[in-house]
Interface confidence: low
């Protein structure tokens, strides 16, 4: 189920799958929610630790049992991923942090009159992931009102420093507030060039596009279909970026599909989950559990309810069925995508709906004049 | 909202506008989305207008002037007014609206978390009231959704300011001693939300007050935590399955 409580002065021991710098526990929790393996997190505010390297440290954690031992650590904040929390799942983070400088690659500097204007510029710049703004009272006069637009390899700051009269925050593109707009078109038989930032296996171009949308550095993608000439590259989804923000070239190529991230769409973003079920397809991955269920939809529901399950295969082979129930293979991988995709099998595959935000699995724990 | 500022897209995605279409169409009240098919509002919004088919509910909007004849809206399937609400009194000013069709959630249209039943221990220090209501006592409905940060006031303090009225434990008050910031006409039924541990919760429903933003006259809100049993009973019995889950 959905667990939203935060544990003050507590730190989860072990289970680390990733670490990064985040300005507060809520942003750390959001990164945990969107990380394919993270179930738990621990965050170290600046006040909680003397070690400068660990200040603002966000530690993403996994556990086979779904829990980890808690140790007392003054100032630390720990909690759960919101993976099964329905409408609370959002990559949108509006907060502005005063007295904090989020470090990264500074690729644009301009003078603006307010931190809100700086955030707006970041939101309207295709490459900007986060920003810092030096206020009018910043100690060095020449830097006052400077708005620094930034990015980093992982989408989170490479460091966070306490610095007076500086305010920082994140792009509001995940809030569907970008003024850039987006290309919804999918280009058949076209391959984009430029830098590959990641490679995953997906059953179709639409899953590839959604993964691109929620990847911090993906601006466009190319997907190689299951009939692509090179067998080892079939179902490969290449997530790409470029200096300009658009592909520098594209090549006509049979059995490829290309398109753009939808992060810059106005007013609506795709859900960070994939609900389609793929008949005749087997998703390979690490086995989490095998259970007998009645029908592929129940198999998907079972995967969704088991928080560590990322995708599933429902087998219809006679040897995998007992009466009306057949085997439901619950699986996971390091990156949340299948490690192999096989066609022509007797069965169906699909993804967990744990990141869908439309479900009702959204527990929110924890005479005069009328108007 | 008196003394407020413009909200931005998606800042308060649970806020809805309750509008009445008779000869013309106008905004009358606010409301809060609490489930795919449920809106929580004030009972007094329906005083004299209990007919379901005259109401139009707009969700996922920021600017009322953007509404055209083509703007999608929800219609009411059922209005559930609290059984103890009386038009002549300010008590039990709470109502549920069941929508004809469930709404999909987006960044601009999603529900607000409800508080725990009888939540009295949480100290809320970051509370906001939102709405399209008047920006002064003899004002007009605002186009852009307004927001204002207002501190909660103890019921004892609130009772001192309203000697002629009974401030019950099922009400919550908010305001500044000096006035200047408050909800006003047209904000009724809308949310008083407070952020605690990174999560927004619906603490109050805008209900009544002496004028708007007057000195030492806080706004009075229906305390949602006191009505959790009623909300859960109505939303669950309506169609046999829980529409929202109460806090654990």
């Amino acid at each position: 189920g959905c667990l939203t409580q935060l544990y003050e002065n507590a730190f989860f021991r072990g289970g680390d799958v990733a670490s990064m710098y985040t300005p507060n526990a809520q942003y750390c929790q959001m990164r945990c929610t969107f990380h394919p393996r993270c179930l738990l997190f621990s965050f170290l505010p600046a006040s909680s630790i003397n070690d400068m390297e660990k200040r603002f440290g966000c530690f993403l954690k996994d556990s086979v049992t779904g829990t980890l031992p808690k140790v007392h650590r003054t100032g630390a904040v720990s909690g759960h991923s919101l993976k099964q929390c329905g409408h609370q799942i959002s990559a949108c983070h509006r907060d502005i942090y005063k007295g904090v400088d989020m470090r990264g690659v500074n690729f644009n500097v301009s003078k603006v009159s307010s931190v809100e204007e700086c955030q707006k510029r970041c939101t309207s710049n295709i490459r900007c992931q986060f920003f810092s703004y030096a206020t009018q009272t910043f100690h060095k006069a020449e830097y006052r009102n400077n708005c620094l637009l930034k990015y980093s390899p992982g989408g989170t700051p490479t460091a966070i420093k306490v610095l007076s009269n500086v305010e920082s925050g994140f792009s509001l593109k995940p809030c569907a507030l970008s003024e850039i707009g987006c290309h919804m078109n999918i280009f058949q038989h076209l391959a984009f060039s430029d830098v590959d930032v990641a490679r995953v296996l997906t059953p179709d171009a639409f899953v590839c596009r959604t993964i691109c949308t929620y990847h911090p550095n993906c601006l466009f993608f190319t997907f190689y279909t299951n009939v692509w000439k090179i067998e080892s590259q079939r179902n490969v989804c290449l997530l790409k970026t470029s200096e300009s923000g658009t592909p520098s070239s594209s090549t006509p190529q049979e059995n490829t599909i290309s398109g753009y991230s939808l992060l810059t769409c106005k007013r609506t973003l795709p859900e960070p989950c994939h609900s389609k079920i793929y008949p005749g397809v087997d998703f390979g991955g690490e086995e989490l559990n095998v259970t007998f269920v009645k029908g592929v939809n129940v198999c998907q529901e079972t995967c969704t309810k088991m928080i560590r399950c990322q995708f599933f295969t429902y087998s219809l082979l006679p040897e995998d069925c007992k009466e009306e129930k057949c085997k439901c293979f619950l699986r996971l991988s390091m990156d949340g995508s299948p490690t192999r995709i096989a066609y022509g099998t007797q069965g169906s595959s699909g993804y967990s709906l744990r990141l869908c935000n439309t479900g009702d699995n959204s527990v929110c724990t924890t005479k005069t004049s009328t108007r | 909202i008196v003394g407020g500022t413009n909200s931005s897209w998606g800042e308060w995605p649970w806020q809805v506008s309750l509008q009445v279409k008779l000869t013309a169409q106008r905004h009358l009240c606010g409301g809060s989305l609490i489930g795919h098919q449920w809106v929580l509002t004030a009972a007094h919004c329906f005083d004299g207008l209990p007919l379901q088919d005259v109401w139009r509910i707009y969700s996922g909007i920021l600017n009322l002037s953007d509404i055209t004849k083509d703007t999608p809206f929800s219609q009411i399937k059922e209005i559930i007014i609290h059984q103890n609400y009386k038009v002549s009194e300010g008590n039990h000013d709470i109502a549920l609206i069941k929508l004809q069709a469930p709404l999909n959630y987006t960044e601009f249209q999603k529900p607000i978390c409800l508080p725990s039943k009888g939540d009295t221990s949480t100290i809320y220090t970051n509370c906001w009231v939102t709405g399209w209501g008047f920006s002064k006592e003899k004002g007009e409905i605002q186009n852009i959704l307004q927001k204002v940060n207002i501190p909660l006031v103890t019921n004892e303090e609130c009772q001192k300011r309203y000697q002629d009225y009974k401030i019950t434990q099922r009400m919550v008050c908010a305001g500044y001693k000096e006035g200047g910031k408050d909800a006003c006409k047209g904000d009724s039924g809308g949310p008083l939300v407070c952020k605690h541990n990174g999560m927004w919760r619906l603490v109050g429903i805008t209900s009544w007050g002496e004028g708007c933003a007057r000195r030492e006259q806080p706004g009075v809100y229906t305390k949602v935590a006191e009505y959790m049993d009623w909300i859960l009973e109505k939303t669950q019995s309506s169609d046999g399955k829980a529409q929202m889950q109460s806090p654990a």
Partner: antibody
Framework: EVQLLESGGGLVQPGGSLRLSCAAS????????MMWVRQAPGKGLEWVSG????????VYADSVKGRFTISRDNSKNTLYLQMNSLRAEDTAVYYC???????????????WGQGTMVTVSS | DIQMTQSPSTLSASVGDRVTITCRAS??????LAWYQQKPGKAPNLLIY???TLESGVPSRFSGSGSGTEFTLTISSLQPDDFATYYC????????FGQGTKVEIK
């Protein structure tokens, strides 16, 4: 530093048109109600028009209603006053102004531009 | 429309004098009244808002009082820099200025 800089004034014949601009800097222009106020030579101050932060709500003094149009471009931090069907009695220094707190009721004007002179004469 | 009437139109006074200017509204404006000082060729300068709240940076010799329809601006001890024209302004319903009071050297 907070600044308002009016421009666009000049000599125009009765019945003519002028467009005044007010360039704002040093504050978040888009958050505030903006005003035009005028002062005829040797006379008192007269409020002309106001525009709310989004530009969605505009208000006018009776003396200019139907002839003047106030507008704003929040992306350019600029306030405008389009003046049509000008009359001799519109001759004045035109100031743009705003109230720093931004709250709708606390809108005495505490920041003013230096003014631009409009002369309507044949 | 709300009309604002100031009196007197002109006031002659000496340095050190206590000076009082009154402003009357044609209908109640609660406390939504401001006072401005203007010197020749310059833009007005806000002194007081909400009838009695001193704008930051304004000397404490300036004070405002009143509510409803009757308002007063008082300069407790007139200084050489205070010779100017003073305007009241209501902002209860839109914005209206009084016709001004010129404070000149006696």
């Amino acid at each position: 530093e907070v600044q308002l800089l009016e421009s666009g004034g000049g000599l125009v014949q009765p019945g003519g048109s002028l467009r005044l601009s007010c360039a704002a800097s040093g504050f978040t222009f888009s958050h505030y109600i903006m005003m035009w106020v005028r002062q005829a030579p040797g006379k008192g101050l007269e409020w002309v028009s106001g525009i709310y932060s989004s530009g969605g709500i505009t208000v006018y003094a009776d003396s200019v209603k139907g002839r003047f149009t106030i507008s704003r471009d929040n992306s350019k931090n600029t306030l405008y006053l389009q003046m049509n069907s000008l009359r001799a009695e519109d001759t004045a220094v035109y100031y743009c102004a705003y109230r720093r707190t931004g709250a709708p009721r606390r809108d005495a004007f505490d920041i003013w531009g230096q003014g631009t002179m409009v002369t309507v004469s044949s | 429309d709300i009309q604002m009437t100031q009196s007197p139109s002109t006031l002659s006074a000496s340095v050190g004098d206590r000076v009082t200017i009154t402003c009357r509204a044609s209908q109640s404006i609660s406390s939504w009244l401001a006072w401005y000082q203007q010197k020749p060729g310059k833009a007005p300068n806000l002194l007081i808002y909400k009838a009695s709240t001193l704008e930051s940076g304004v000397p404490s010799r300036f004070s405002g009082s009143g509510s409803g329809t009757e308002f007063t601006l008082t300069i407790s001890s007139l200084q050489p820099d205070d010779f100017a024209t003073y305007y009241c302004q209501q902002y209860n319903t839109y914005w209206t200025f009084g016709q001004g009071t010129k404070v000149e050297i006696k």
